[in-house]
């Protein structure tokens, strides 16, 4: 069963290589457990960046070594991806699954193009 997922078209990472965006889903029912996955699409290859399952009212927790953090509020998930470099520029897709209660629903956003510009190294001072 398909579900609509909205996310911004473009986001620019800051100078520290951190990018944040909101992933919003139109829940057809009363979701109480949700799984959010961030996918990166580059050169027709899709790879999983990070994923988290959370119960409503509980914090959104990614694995300890994940480059993602996030918070949830209602049908919105605020995602932050850290440690990005220029080579990580690409389309980041938000996938949302309503895991519980049944029925299961899944939706995939159109993706957020994240642009990352490596900071210029500071010139040596004599």
């Amino acid at each position: 069963k398909a579900m609509h997922v909205a996310q911004p078209a473009v986001v620019l990472a800051n100078s520290r290589g951190t990018a944040s965006f909101v992933c919003e889903y139109a829940s057809p029912g009363k979701a109480t457990e949700v799984r959010v996955t961030v996918l990166r699409q580059a050169d027709s290859q899709v790879t999983e960046v990070c994923a988290a399952t959370y119960m409503m009212g509980n914090e959104l927790t990614f694995l300890d070594d994940s480059i993602c953090t996030g918070t949830s509020s209602g049908n919105q998930v605020n995602l932050t991806i850290q440690g990005l470099r220029a080579m990580d520029t690409g389309l980041y897709i938000c996938k949302v699954e309503l895991m519980y209660p049944p029925p299961y629903y899944m939706g995939i956003g159109n993706g957020t193009q994240i642009y990352v510009i490596d900071p210029e190294p500071c010139p040596d001072s004599d």
């Epitope: 109480t32 457990e33 119960m55 409503m56 009212g57 509980n58 519980y100 049944p102 029925p103 299961y104």
Partner: antibody, heavy 120, light 112 residues
Framework: EVQLRQSGPELVKPGTSVKISCKAS????????INWVKQNHGKSLEWIGD????????NSNQKFEGKATLTVDKSSSTAYMELRSLTSEDSAVYYC?????????????WGQGTSVTVSS | DIVMTQAAFSNPVTLGTSASISCRSS???????????LYWYLQKPGQSPQLLIY???NLASGVPDRFSSSGSGTDFTLRISRVEAEDVGVYYC?????????FGAGTKLELK
């Protein structure tokens, strides 16, 4: 060791209410939904509903709406089910059970059951 | 509501032989995501139910590999390859494709 410890048997009069408890131990209480299931003496199982221990949000079987109220007390890791306006039809064994997401929300641990007998 | 149908009794089985228990659902439990939302529970005499199988064919932790389960979207079979005395009880199939979660009436496994 994961355990769900339920309160003892109840003998109650028709028209009254009863509140059953289910104390969880051996795991983080707020990480798992708690379900409640009815079993009419030796017969099949009926799902009553579930509760999210984080915020008290519930899903319920329409058949039991107005009959069963589910609550939790996070501080004591205890789930409760109150049954009201009791009739002989409510005489049964009631189980609490934990849902496990790794098993696609199957009930992986069950309480020992609480017998409720409604009789005048 | 999805109705789960089971026979009340299995054919009596001899210890060490195989047994099969059937279950039918009134609606396909195979979701478009490829998951079949079918579960098996065993209730031994005087005990609470215990989980055996989830997602139609996956064994829960601690369940002996003598148990296996298969099926289509609506017809399911639980098999016990070498029945032991401790396998006696009532076997329930259940679905959680949609609310309310529903159980079969249970099939009692009896020994010869």
């Amino acid at each position: 060791e994961v355990q769900l410890r339920q309160s003892g048997p109840e003998l109650v009069k028709p028209g009254t209410s009863v509140k059953i408890s289910c104390k969880a131990s051996g795991y983080k209480f707020t990480d798992h939904f708690i379900n409640w299931v009815k079993q009419n003496h030796g017969k099949s199982l009926e799902w009553i509903g579930d509760i999210n221990p984080n915020n008290g949000g519930t899903n319920s079987n329409q058949k039991f709406e107005g009959k069963a109220t589910l609550t939790v007390d996070k501080s004591s890791s205890t789930a409760y089910m109150e049954l009201r306006s009791l009739t002989s039809e409510d005489s049964a064994v009631y189980y609490c059970a934990r849902l496990r997401r790794e098993y696609f929300y199957a009930m992986d641990y069950w309480g020992q059951g609480t017998s409720v007998t409604v009789s005048s | 509501d999805i109705v789960m149908t089971q026979a009340a009794f299995s054919n009596p089985v001899t210890l060490g032989t195989s047994a099969s228990i059937s279950c039918r659902s009134s609606k396909s439990l195979l979701h478009s995501n490829g998951i079949t939302y079918l579960y098996w529970y065993l209730q031994k005499p005087g005990q609470s139910p215990q989980l055996l199988i989830y997602q139609m064919s996956n064994l829960a932790s601690g369940v002996p590999d003598r148990f296996s389960s298969s099926g289509s979207g609506t017809d399911f079979t639980l098999r016990i390859s070498r029945v032991e005395a401790e396998d006696v009880g009532v076997y329930y199939c259940a679905q959680n494709l949609e609310l309310p979660l529903t159980f079969g009436a249970g099939t009692k496994l009896e020994l010869k």
